[in-house]
Interface confidence: low
Amino acid sequence: DPVLCFTQYEESSGKCKGLLGGGVSVEDCCLNTAFAYQKRSGGLCQPCRSPRWSLWSTWAPCSVTCSEGSQLRYRRCVGWNGQCSGKVAPGTLEWQLQACEDQQCCPEMGGWSGWGPWEPCSVTCSKGTRTRRRACNHPAPKCGGHCPGQAQESEACDTQQVCPTHGAWATWGPWTPCSASCHGGPHEPKETRSRKCSAPEPSQKPPGKPCPGLAYEQRRCTGLPPCPVAGGWGPWGPVSPCPVTCGLGQTMEQRTCNHPVPQHGGPFCAGDATRTHICNTAVPCPVDGEWDSWGEWSPCIRRNMKSISCQEIPGQQSRGRTCRGRKFDGHRCAGQQQDIRHCYSIQHCPLKGSWSEWSTWGLCMPPCGPNPTRARQRLCTPLLPKYPPTVSMVEGQGEKNVTFWGRPLPRCEELQGQKLVVEEKRPCLHVPACKDPEEEEL
């Protein structure tokens, strides 16, 4: 028969989870032992694994609520293709029965005593209620039982007395105008209001109570502006220490407008809150050293060789710079004083050249003189030899970059009758006059 096939079996609840589908045989569903099946929707869920007993169910409620009864629990053989211990087929229930007792005895009803006397009327004037009571003790109930009906009953009563009228206050009258126009002056401003004991007045016969409390009240006026207080200077404070350790500085004295602080629109103190003085440390300030620009590279040479010019022989050259201007224990210049690099010397070497493109136009010269012109050039540019761009001078110290150094003698075909430089000049147009911008502002 076809069954509903599920992907999970929940051990704790015995429920099938994750419906895969219906219309398959048990044998096909249970090709995967993690699956489970139901013969019909809502029917018993059986896991595909080999059969074993489920956990015992919780005990059913006791068969009676009082005295001794009994209660059942069960477990089920769940699984497929086999038997549980005791050679029991899947789906079979096994039961356990035990004695139980929720409450030792069963409740027994009690009986009422006779009614007691009526209590006094609940009021001393006009109409009220009165009450009488009875006890559940003829006989007393047992084992949590009770008596049927109510333990007390009430009825209306009339004292035949007129009730007195007690006094109550009418609403407060308006506040009187304030006794001053600002607060914080010599007299604290106040306002007053009153009320009457007339809502209602207390009765004369029988005598009613008078109204409780006072017939008038006073309060501080709110919303008034504070009275203005003019500010006054406090004393000058100490002179601040000279803020510099060399050269001239500026020290300061301060005073505060707080004797008293101006308040509520009162005027601030007149005059300055600070005054300054020059202080002199009489110590010259340190001046840090600054590197000059690098000097020219020294000629490219190789130790123990008279000349390496125009040869594929790497040499070395250096340039230096000077730390200038350091005074009065200022910082020394950081970094290296000498720079060394590897080089090929092409000083005065005849090299094949080629004409460059035109340079960009230069500046107009002279800038402030008559008839300034600008120029551009084409240069005979040497074609550098294809020497290796890096060399290894010392074993194990890695490759070093090598730079060409020196002024070679480039050779180009003549251009416009020139061998090294061809220049073109043009006049500069609409030239403005040179004026000192500072003088222009005056």
């Epitope: 730390c323 910082h331 020394r332 210049c333 950081a334 970094g335 004083q337 000498q338």
Partner: nanobody, 123 residues
Framework: QVQLVESGGGSVHAGGSLRLSCAVS????????MAWFRQAPGKEREGVAS????????WYADSVKGRFTISQDNAENTLYLQMNSLKSEDTAMYYC????????????????WGQGTQVTVSS
């Protein structure tokens, strides 16, 4: 006057480590150069490493780059040289040197020198 006292030298197998210290006294300037030099028997004295006093500018000889580290503790007025992966060619007398001037490198025209500490590396 300026005094430099080296310590921490000794004998070690190749591949081992040593840490040299140089206690500096009387050196009042906050800047200048501190350096380590070494001299192997029959060879010229050579610069090993230098550092700008109170700063981080460092210089190392190519032969010790990646193996030796120079450092300073200005509060304690001490110069250190941590020497790792030692080789037999590192065997030499090691000197501490100081100078108020720049540049900080391996040239030996320093004004103040210690007495030296011997380092011997055996293979």
């Amino acid at each position: 006057q300026v005094q430099l006292v080296e310590s921490g030298g000794g004998s070690v197998h190749a591949g081992g480590s040593l840490r040299l210290s140089c206690a500096v006294s009387g050196y009042t300037h906050s800047t200048g150069c501190m350096a380590w030099f070494r001299q192997a028997p029959g060879k010229e004295r050579e610069g090993v490493a230098s550092i700008i006093r109170g700063e981080r500018g460092e210089w190392y000889a190519d032969s010790v780059k990646g193996r030796f580290t120079i450092s300073q503790d200005n509060a304690e007025n001490t110069l250190y040289l941590q020497m790792n992966s030692l080789k037999s060619e590192d065997t030499a007398m090691y000197y501490c040197a100081a100078d108020y001037r720049y540049p900080c490198d391996g040239r030996s025209n320093y004004d103040y020198w210690g007495q030296g500490t011997q380092v011997t590396v055996s293979s």
